[in-house]
Interface confidence: low
């Protein structure tokens, strides 16, 4: 039976959602157990001209041995104005200077990236050392980098379409996911459903999708329902600030008990199929539904309420 | 092309010194890790000691077997490397070949062999 | 430190014959690196990051491995085969080499 509820963009203030992942569009980690030098390389394309970026370097023990160096690679396309924060790490960081500023002192050795292509910037750092990992982002708003991390399956760091960069790097765009919204006709009440859809990403480990739920509307006023859908492969830490009812794909567990999982239910894995559960759960509109690639940490703020859907 | 030529080698008495150069051409010299590594008569290969580009303010790094004792420089507007060799011991006899480090050892130089004996 | 140990020492084959030589790491590293040496030669670089050959490198040589355990293969040995291969690592400090394999005519 076909679910009629059309599903559009909601205006950002009725809800936004953020989120961090692994996923690239391009990437690689490579091996490295105990490298002397960690050579990364991160490719940043800002569409909208210039922009600001949080950068974060965290370094790890490896078998009780910090790196010896590592050496960071910033290509941008445009003018950046980067907060670095890399305690500790005996960085060297090569990037183009006329294109990025430094909020602060940087603190680190810096060097003059030549202005090459890819291929050839790519060249240039395994000239340093071999590559641990590389990185094309698109549009990112903060990146974390961590150290001591790599567990690549390649011996060498070679560019390839669609990665997910594991462990090693996370990053959260500055455009946040498109969140749609629609009434589903026929049901009567207030009872609201948010809906998340992971996506399943390029490697299947099991992962923990943190999810955070921001409503802003008295407890007494919400009669809503999460519904988290993702690969098998995906479990669930809720985070939220209001009691609502919770209906998973995988097992779930709360913030504030999360030792204690709970199992979750077979969900249907396509659009309509997460709408017609949000109709069987009585819901009468669905307040947020979004699709996302997969992601560990997923930031939902709704002002809906169980009121009027406003669609931008 | 990548060229490299060692000298300086020849008879030394143990404690004593000597100092090895290492000609290079063909490339950025600058931009390069460059290492020492040894080869005592019928043995195998031993690495000495590296030092590295001007991006990364020229580090060095040595064999425990050397460390102490020799030391590794550079001149990049000469586009030379040196390895200064004191305390010199018997053990330390061999040829020496200064190499490029770019992902592995690329280019190594003919070798100069070094003699410390009494 | 990574003691590399090559096995064998020495191998005494014919023209036309499969050789395999092992390098066995004392832990993990990341990739190997395989140089050929020829007597009152300096080496040359023969297979770089564990598979891939150096430039100039016949086809018949092949290089495998991971973690501990890495080989060099030569598919059918040819008379300027005869050498002595050697493995390095540095993916921990300090460098070191494997003892070497010395392929000869039988």
């Known amino acids: 039976e076909t679910v009629h509820c059309d599903l559009q963009p909601v205006g950002p203030e009725r809800g936004e959602v953020t989120y961090t992942t692994s996923q690239v569009s391009k990437g690689c980690v490579a091996q490295a157990p105990n490298a002397i030098l960690e050579v990364h390389v991160l490719f940043l394309e800002f569409p909208t001209g210039p922009s600001q970026l949080e950068l974060t370097l965290q370094a790890s023990k490896q078998n009780g041995t910090w790196p010896r160096e590592v050496l960071l690679v910033l290509s941008v396309n445009s003018s950046v104005f980067l907060h670095l924060q890399a305690l500790g790490i005996p960085l060297h960081l090569a990037y183009n200077s006329s294109l990025v500023t430094f909020q602060e002192p940087p603190g680190v050795n810096t060097t003059e990236l030549p202005s090459f292509p890819k291929t050839q910037i790519l060249e240039w750092a395994a000239e340093r050392g071999p590559i641990t990992s590389a990185a094309e982002l698109n549009d990112p708003q903060s990146i974390l980098l961590r150290l001591g991390q790599a567990q690549g399956s390649l011996s060498f760091c070679m560019l390839e379409a669609s990665q997910d960069m594991g462990r090693t790097l996370e990053w959260r765009p500055r455009t946040p996911a498109l969140v749609r919204g629609c009434h589903l006709e026929g049901v009567a009440g207030h009872k609201e459903a948010h809906i998340l859809r992971v996506l399943p990403g390029h490697s299947a480990g099991p992962r923990t999708v943190t999810v955070k739920v921001e409503l802003s509307c008295a407890p007494g006023d919400l009669d809503a329902v999460l519904i988290l859908q993702g690969p098998p492969y995906v479990s669930w830490l809720i985070d939220a600030n209001h009691n609502m009812q919770i209906w998973t794909t995988g097992e779930y567990s709360f913030k504030i008990f999360p030792e204690k999982n709970i199992r979750g239910f077979k969900l249907p894995d396509t659009p309509q199929g997460l709408l017609g559960e949000a109709r069987m759960l009585n819901a009468s509109i669905v307040a947020s539904f979004v699709e996302l690639p997969l992601a560990s940490i997923v930031s939902l703020h709704a002002s809906s309420c169980g009121g009027r859907l406003q669609t931008s | 092309e990548v060229q490299l030529v060692e000298s300086g080698g020849g008879l030394v008495k143990p404690g004593g010194s000597l100092r090895l150069s290492c000609a290079a051409s063909g490339f950025t010299f600058s931009d390069a890790w460059m290492d020492w590594v040894r080869q005592a008569p019928g043995k195998g290969l031993e690495w000495v000691g590296e030092?590295?580009?001007?991006?990364?303010?020229?580090?060095?790094y040595y064999a425990e077997s050397v460390k102490g004792r020799f030391t590794i420089s550079r001149d990049d507007s000469k586009n030379t490397l040196y390895l200064q060799m004191n305390s010199l011991k018997t053990e330390d006899t061999a040829v020496y070949y200064c190499t490029r480090w770019r992902r592995f050892f690329d280019s190594w130089g003919q070798g100069t062999l070094v003699t410390v004996s009494s | 430190d990574i003691q590399l140990t090559q096995s064998p020492s020495s191998l005494s084959a014919s023209v036309g014959d499969r050789a395999t030589i092992t390098c066995r790491a004392s832990?993990?590293?990341?990739?190997m690196h395989w140089y050929q040496q020829k007597p009152g030669k300096a080496p040359k670089p023969w297979i770089y990051?564990?598979?891939n050959l150096a430039s100039g490198v016949p086809s018949r040589f092949s290089g495998s491995g991971s973690g501990t355990d890495y080989t060099l293969t030569i598919s059918s040995l040819q008379p300027e085969d005869f050498a002595t291969y050697y493995c390095?690592?540095?993916?921990?400090?300090?460098?070191?080499f494997g003892g070497g394999t010395k392929v000869e005519i039988k």
């Open positions: 390095q690592q540095w993916s921990s400090n300090p460098l070191t």
């Open positions: 030092i590295r580009s001007q991006a990364s303010n020229h580090a060095t």
């Open positions: 832990s993990s590293v990341s990739y």
């Open positions: 990051a564990s598979s």
